[in-house]
């Protein structure tokens, strides 16, 4: 059976511009090293938002300047994307790659549509 990656269809970012969703995969092999990449698709353009490689049972580590954080539990990854603005609204796709030991496998989710609404500015208090 092909590696299946599941993620929610829609998520609404909170007022601070933070969105969280779960990326879950059905693994065809017993991987010890997994790479998770979040890709944003908008207007047929695909850009990489963030990526992390982790050892099964260990914490997910993104680069220091990444807008993503995450935790892992078995075949489930809890992803959080921060600093989002209305212009960042789009389809966020979870890609999972089983890197080690061989064989390599790849699975790609259908994407999570993240809606971001910029907060209304506070009215002046004179």
């Amino acid at each position: 059976k092909a590696m299946h990656v599941a993620q929610p269809a829609v998520v609404l970012a909170n007022s601070r511009g933070t969105a969280s969703f779960v990326c879950e995969y059905a693994s065809p092999g017993k991987a010890t090293e997994v790479r998770v990449t979040v890709l944003r698709q908008a207007d047929s353009q695909v850009t990489e938002v963030c990526a992390a490689t982790y050892m099964m049972g260990n914490e997910l580590t993104f680069l220091d300047d990444s807008i993503c954080t995450g935790t892992s539990s078995g075949n489930q990854v809890n992803l959080t994307i921060q600093g989002l603005r209305a212009m960042d609204t789009g389809l966020y796709i979870c890609k999972v790659e089983l890197m080690y030991p061989p064989p390599y496998y790849m699975g790609i989710g259908n994407g999570t549509q993240i809606y971001v609404i910029d907060p209304e500015p506070c009215p002046d208090s004179d």
Epitope: K1, A2, M3, P28, L39, Q41, V46, T47, E48, I93, K95, M99, Y100, P102, P103, Y104, Y105, M106, G107, I108
Partner: antibody, heavy 123, light 107 residues
Framework: QVQLVESGGGVVQPGRSLRLSCAAS????????MHWVRQAPGKGLEWVAV????????YYADSVKGRFTISRDDSKNTLYLQMSSLRAEDTAVYYC????????????????WGQGTLVTVSS | DIQMTQSPSSLSASVGDRVTITCRAS??????LNWYQQKPGKAPKLLIY???SLQSGVPSRFSGSGSGTDFTLTISSLQPEDFATYYC?????????FGPGTKVDIK
Amino acid sequence: QVQLVESGGGVVQPGRSLRLSCAASGFTFSSYGMHWVRQAPGKGLEWVAVIWYDGSYKYYADSVKGRFTISRDDSKNTLYLQMSSLRAEDTAVYYCARAPHYAILTGYYEDYWGQGTLVTVSS
Amino acid sequence: DIQMTQSPSSLSASVGDRVTITCRASQSISSYLNWYQQKPGKAPKLLIYAASSLQSGVPSRFSGSGSGTDFTLTISSLQPEDFATYYCQQSYSTPFTFGPGTKVDIK
């Protein structure tokens, strides 16, 4: 334009070693995964090995595992295939091919190929 | 390893014919399938990737379809330059195996 030029092929005796090179130009070499694919005379294509764009991962066909090593030198825009313990069945044209690796929503695919270099293993 | 099979192994066709080549994987590979064309003495050329995406510069008479285990390459109207051997390849899991090829020659 994208160019891949293989070199290093030739006639070699069984059990000996050979190193193939693939010189790349016309694109940002360090942003692409690279593959070696071979084709025995009159036969079909056989995938040999891949190296990730940053050199972090390498994968091999079972038929060459433990005997062949794929590597890259991004400062020279060159891909290598070190072949040891060569056998008659390794006789083939060896192609290098590039594979887009960044922000890919598809499986990997070889979009540009070199013209190949012939390796003949014979006593 | 995932095994790839192709049918037919060879076919004879005329210019203008509609040609269909099938590729089957030994297990589900989702849509991670590529098609290549190779002419004698030449390097392979990418036609289709991800089962149905047409590579830039490839004529629109080539199309691909399928997912899971069964895939098809169709040439809607065969042209003289299309006589060649066609290979499918899976890129779901290493080793990225090729099918044995389908040779298309002139009837």
